[in-house]
Amino acid sequence: IIGGSMDAKGSFPWQAKMISRHGLTTGATLISDQWLLTTAKNLFLNHSETASAKDITPTLTLYVGKNQLVEIEKVVLHPNHSVVDIGLIKLKQRVLVTERVMPICLPSKDYIAPGRVGYVSGWGRNANFRFTDRLKYVMLPVADQDKCVVHYENSTVPEKKNLTSPVGVQPILNEHTFCAGLTKYQEDTCYGDAGSAFAIHDMEEDTWYAAGILSFDKSCAVAEYGVYVRATDLKDWVQETMAKN
Amino acid sequence: IIGGSMDAKGSFPWQAKMISRHGLTTGATLISDQWLLTTAKNLFLNHSETASAKDITPTLTLYVGKNQLVEIEKVVLHPNHSVVDIGLIKLKQRVLVTERVMPICLPSKDYIAPGRVGYVSGWGRNANFRFTDRLKYVMLPVADQDKCVVHYENSTVPEKKNLTSPVGVQPILNEHTFCAGLTKYQEDTCYGDAGSAFAIHDMEEDTWYAAGILSFDKSCAVAEYGVYVRATDLKDWVQETMAKN
Amino acid sequence: VELGNDAMDFEDDSCPKPPEIANGYVEHLVRYRCRQFYRLRAEGDGVYTLNDEKQWVNTVAGEKLPECEAVCGKPKHPVDQVQ
Amino acid sequence: VELGNDAMDFEDDSCPKPPEIANGYVEHLVRYRCRQFYRLRAEGDGVYTLNDEKQWVNTVAGEKLPECEAVCGKPKHPVDQVQ
């Protein structure tokens, strides 16, 4: 997280820290007491594109709450993970839910609307480009999708598109994604924050929902927008996968 | 009831028989285990128009179920009883509800629609113009209101109205009333049936509702329509009165 | 008049212990029921538990007891709707 | 971890008899509850009564017990929503 605030109170008990092969920090989001969402890209970090979920599983280390190590039983990649940058992690044991460790809900309603603010917590790189040692969070507005597409791809018209990412890496942008950021204080997500939730507070229900999962965490206040996978598009697959496994 | 059928099974456990001063039989309808609805006209039978509820109370005898005598504590007349022909009777003790003695529900929904069939039970006069000694009932369709008004008042236009009741007595007809009858078999309500419910079966809820209370029971298959007070217009007053008393 | 059987006698301590569930516990209660042709009218759900003062209380109604109110419009033998 | 107090010990027969109500009776039950941060997932309402075979049964779920599932999206210390 570039800028933002320290999570002193444990306000993001769904936030997990995942250490990938070769020690890179990434994010994951607890969505039940035995399952987490993260990005497919996170899972493939330092693996070849042909790696299987079985190959990936033993290379990951996962922490929830206050540095509580949890063991991973399996990884399930989204069947269309090159388009929907998502994977699921199943733990060997259910975690005990406490005030420090609690899943976030997956939404049935579509909370995404330009200007709406969400909270993104993360263990990713800070303004010094170091991985943070204390959980941070930032408050980011949902962006206008067309502006985001133009920012990264020059145009919304397919034949006029070309790759214009200010950070040299292109996000996956499609109907399953939305964009958020930047704040006027130049606060943003950064490397290692991917897999974290775009958390929205439904005030009617007094419940926090993961409206999205951060996929493109390379903006780092250089590019204007982080890109998130829409959680509403995941719910059916998530529920089926959890039920099957 | 003129024509109709005998209630052999006890299908109208809300039906009460009220004997007024000088032994006239009338109807009343159990709407809770301590309260009944009847018409104001029934209560005033053989009393002067200036009689008070306190004067009327001791002159009434009331039976529920299979001739079970119940004692009356008080009578409450509708505040506008010359327009809304209704009164409430409170019993000294709650009756024990059994398969023979059970209140009918008052509706929140408006069940009245032309052509809809309701059931009216009663202890009133039969085709021989004698009071029946066994409870009878008849199935009657809700009538078109304008036809009913024309039948009794010659016109629906106020300035063209004149009193044309085929039975020489005029019903109270207004926005608080509806009409029902006659069947093709010349079945009808008659003297003494007033105070009985126009009972409609809500098949969705499998519950019987008093959609109306028979006010004008003088049709006797000579005039075409009985006239009923709409129960939806009574509910608030009934609930307030029961709560206050 | 059928008044229902109490599932557990207050003088009977031979009651089998209910099974435990993960992350849960059991609470012992009484539920008020109504005889035939009556239904429960309660501020809460008609279920009462013993508080520390050994009084039966409902979470919503407190010590206030429910009432059994007469059912309406449910004749045991509805009319045969024929002509 | 707070697991709740059992309101009535199974070995304790000093339980005060609940008050009677007109036209009603009482039924004795156990209700499954969940510890903090969990909620009951049950086919029925989580309330079980003893049947004639002295088994704890729920009207909907039968002998199948409920589960305590993790609550989601209810942090004890939500973020201060200010900037």
Epitope: - | Y111, E204, Y209 | D80 | -
Partner: antibody, heavy 121, light 107 residues
Framework: EVQLLESGGGLVQPGGSLKLSCVAS????????MSWVRQAPGKGLEWVST????????FYADSVRGRFTISRDNSNNMLFLQIDSLRAEDTAVYYC??????????????WGQGALVTVSS | DIQMTQSPSSLSASVGDRVAITCRAS??????LAWYQQKPGKVPKLLIY???ILQSGVPSRFSGSGSGTDFTLTISSLQPEDVATYYC?????????FGGGTKVEIK
């Protein structure tokens, strides 16, 4: 005049899904039970599903249970039928129908014009 | 579930004839039965409900009778405009099954 207007019909492949809508006007929609009835080409009427007025009770014919889902939106006077796992035998005109009286399940006094659903590969 | 069986499945009669269509329920449904008329290419039209009550606007040559399990729709004097398929439907509680239909034609 009471009106019922269906939409959402069309050609679908076996195994596919479709959502039919019925918009109602000129009556107090929430007070009436509403149903879907279908008619296969050249065949008779078949009751499909009913949604109660009060609460949220839903009923289905055995032939569609588990595949069809009826729902209603009283605030917008709309009735829906979500049709999943479509089969060739689901090909029919689907009618939206209103119970005649408050508290009644059936005896439909108003019908929509029908929406044709064709299941074919 | 209660089955509704209509007979005959089709009939042909002359103008002015008295025509009767029967509908049998596999279990008693009291008088909770409706009759519909459907002309080719048109939506069904309610004729009779509660077994014998004529829907407003329906000609009086149509009548219904019966209760329990056996019901009859009668057209006292068949008219050319009565050419249609007629259906019964149980209306007591779901499932709200229809009969198979009776096609009425003019000789």
């Amino acid at each position: 005049e009471v009106q019922l207007l269906e939409s959402g019909g069309g050609l679908v492949q076996p195994g596919g899904s479709l959502k039919l809508s019925c918009v109602a006007s000129e009556f107090t929609f929430s007070n009436y039970a509403m149903s879907w009835v279908r008619q296969a080409p050249g065949k008779g009427l078949e009751w499909v599903s009913t949604f109660s007025s009060g609460g949220s009770r839903t009923f289905y014919a055995d032939s569609v249970r588990g595949r069809f889902t009826i729902s209603r939106d009283n605030s917008n006077n709309m009735l829906f039928l979500q049709i999943d796992s479509l089969r060739a035998e689901d090909t029919a005109v689907y009618y939206c129908a209103k119970a005649q009286f408050v508290g009644h399940w059936a005896q439909y006094n108003y019908w929509g014009q029908g929406a044709l659903v064709t299941v074919s590969s | 579930d209660i089955q509704m069986t209509q007979s005959p499945s089709s009939l042909s009669a002359s103008v002015g004839d008295r025509v009767a269509i029967t509908c049998r329920a596999s279990q008693g449904i009291r008088n909770y039965l409706a009759w519909y008329q459907q002309k080719p290419g048109k939506v069904p039209k309610l004729l009779i409900y509660d077994a014998f009550i004529l829907q407003s606007g329906v000609p009086s040559r149509f009548s219904g009778s019966g209760s329990g399990t056996d019901f009859t729709l009668t057209i006292s004097s068949l008219q050319p405009e009565d050419v249609a398929t007629y259906y019964c439907q149980k209306s007591d509680s779901p499932p709200l099954t229809f009969g198979g239909g009776t096609k009425v034609e003019i000789k």
